[in-house]
Amino acid sequence: IPVIEPSVPELVVKPGATVTLRCVGNGSVEWDGPPSPHWTLYSDGSSSILSTNNATFQNTGTYRCTEPGDPLGGSAAIHLYVKDPARPWNVLAQEVVVFEDQDALLPCLLTDPVLEAGVSLVRVRGRPLMRHTNYSFSPWHGFTIHRAKFIQSQDYQCSALMGGRKVMSISIRLKVQKVIPGPPALTLVPAELVRIRGEAAQIVCSASSVDVNFDVFLQHNNTKLAIPQQSDFHNNRYQKVLTLNLDQVDFQHAGNYSCVASNVQGKHSTSMFFRVVESAYLNLSSEQNLIQEVTVGEGLNLKVMVEAYPGLQGFNWTYLGPFSDHQPEPKLANATTKDTYRHTFTLSLPRLKPSEAGRYSFLARNPGGWRALTFELTLRYPPEVSVIWTFINGSGTLLCAASGYPQPNVTWLQCSGHTDRCDEAQVLQVWDDPYPEVLSQEPFHKVTVQSLLTVETLEHNQTYECRAHNSVGSGSWAFIPISAGAHTHPPDEFLFTP
């Protein structure tokens, strides 16, 4: 650690005195202190001499000697008072700049330690300090306003009592800056804009920050626009607003608009797109397939995306048949607006009944006309099966009718014994009917197919089963010949009821 001579913590001298401060260290040493005049510095290896032969009140301050090469960063200090009866204060700063909630040191150094008892801090022109100003004083350093607030940005003077009267220092301006958390907050409205050529449009770019020092501008396709700025202050924030008013838009006004704001913390920007169109438009689309298939009893949401300008004047969902004249319940239709020009309309169809298959149309209207988008909804059903014994062209025939959607395929099984359903162990014979005859196939209805199995003689201790299946499920019917005639068995679990 360097050593200062004279080896006292404080030195009190009169104006005009010669002062010599010597610092000795192991290596080279350096002096630091208040910015003050009339000192001469002379370094000689490991010692450095600071001297003045005409000390003034401005030399009052703490002089510190450091050894740059010392890894521990040791230093020694001496405080010099130049006791001037006419100048009780040496003010080291014209202005003090701190951030909110930092301590603000107002560097009024007392030139005579005896005066410490009668010091006070005031605002200029003798005004008292603001309420809740918490401060302390050190004769070596000055007044510290603790946890300074923005509102305490004022001009201050240090006051000392000399011979019964108050002597003021020159003023110190305190600037308490708001802590700027980041670049200014931005809004650009609207987020998107569409206008027909000749209409009026307005784009508003606004930025706000806790600090007034920020810039904001609006640019169109990378060209900065010259727009008068409106400034405001509310909710403890500074606001700057740029409003672009276009009385009659044309195609050259279209394009990308960016609102850009910057401060010392950085830059924020946000963009929007302005479309200029020749005339009104209305486009309907769906991400879904317009042909829908759903299993009976399940639910379905039909969604339509609408892109329109100007806004819609009307819209509705309509059921176009074929089963009934019922219309979708309004409570099952809802609309959500994605943004100004795009909307999604949803029709919810829960627990679909057979009578609800068919065509659903969404209709919308705006000044550009009306448009419709139609969905076709077909219900899927598991097969229903029935078997009868009949004679066709004199031959005994088992006739199986299967009804479902999608079209069922049919398999015949012959098995030993009397049973409701053939199991693998009992099966004697299997016939697949790849091309059953289609009896009915209307849109939105079940498909009914018929399969014939010609049987010369019915074996009495056997069961004939017709099985039908599709992507939804399967159904079967067991036919058991008995002496008194034929006997049929639908399986226990049948029938399906939606």
Partner: antibody, heavy 118, light 110 residues
Amino acid sequence: QVQLQESGPGLVKPSETLSLTCTVSGGSISSYYWSWIRQSAGKGLEWIGHIYTSGSTNYNPSLKSRVTMSVDTSKNQFSLKLSSVTAADTAVYYCARERTVVTYFDYWGQGTLVTVSS
Amino acid sequence: QSVLTQPPSASGTPGQRVTISCSGSSSNIGSNTVNWYQQLPGTAPKLLIYSNNQRPSGVPDRFSGSKSGTSASLAISGLQSEDEADYYCAAWDDSLNGPVFGGGTKLTVL
């Protein structure tokens, strides 16, 4: 070894505010005075002002009404704001460490040219 | 117009001794110490002399400074081609309450 680096826009419009930041590396910003000095073809080297790490500032009287300096010890940075600029403020701006008592500048940034033009 | 006055140019041949003067007033050089800076082309100024005649480490002893009254001078002995630069004097000014600079002297090594 202490190093200083100026940063900020190279072009400022007349009447706007010039803002520069100096980042100190290789040493602590604490317990020193930090200065801004500018050099223009017409006026040579001109001291703008200095700031101590406590926030104490002194400015050149000719610029005092337009200057604000601040320091952020947590970032090892100090900054300069010069408002209402004119073409006369076009210069190379340097930040430097100021040694007080006998005032001299022992470390300098490389300088940044700021042009004031519309 | 700079507060401290320097000749705009000076020159010398390699090996020669060159002196650059700096003139001020009682409020600056007359009552405070003088510093000298060297500015090589395209670079920032570099401290050459502080407190009238003190050399920072790394500065060759060919450079020396002196002060008398309200004037100061920088002497460069054994001139070398790499000494071609602009040289500025500076001093604290009591009336300004801050440092002032000279207008600079362009040294050419012939």
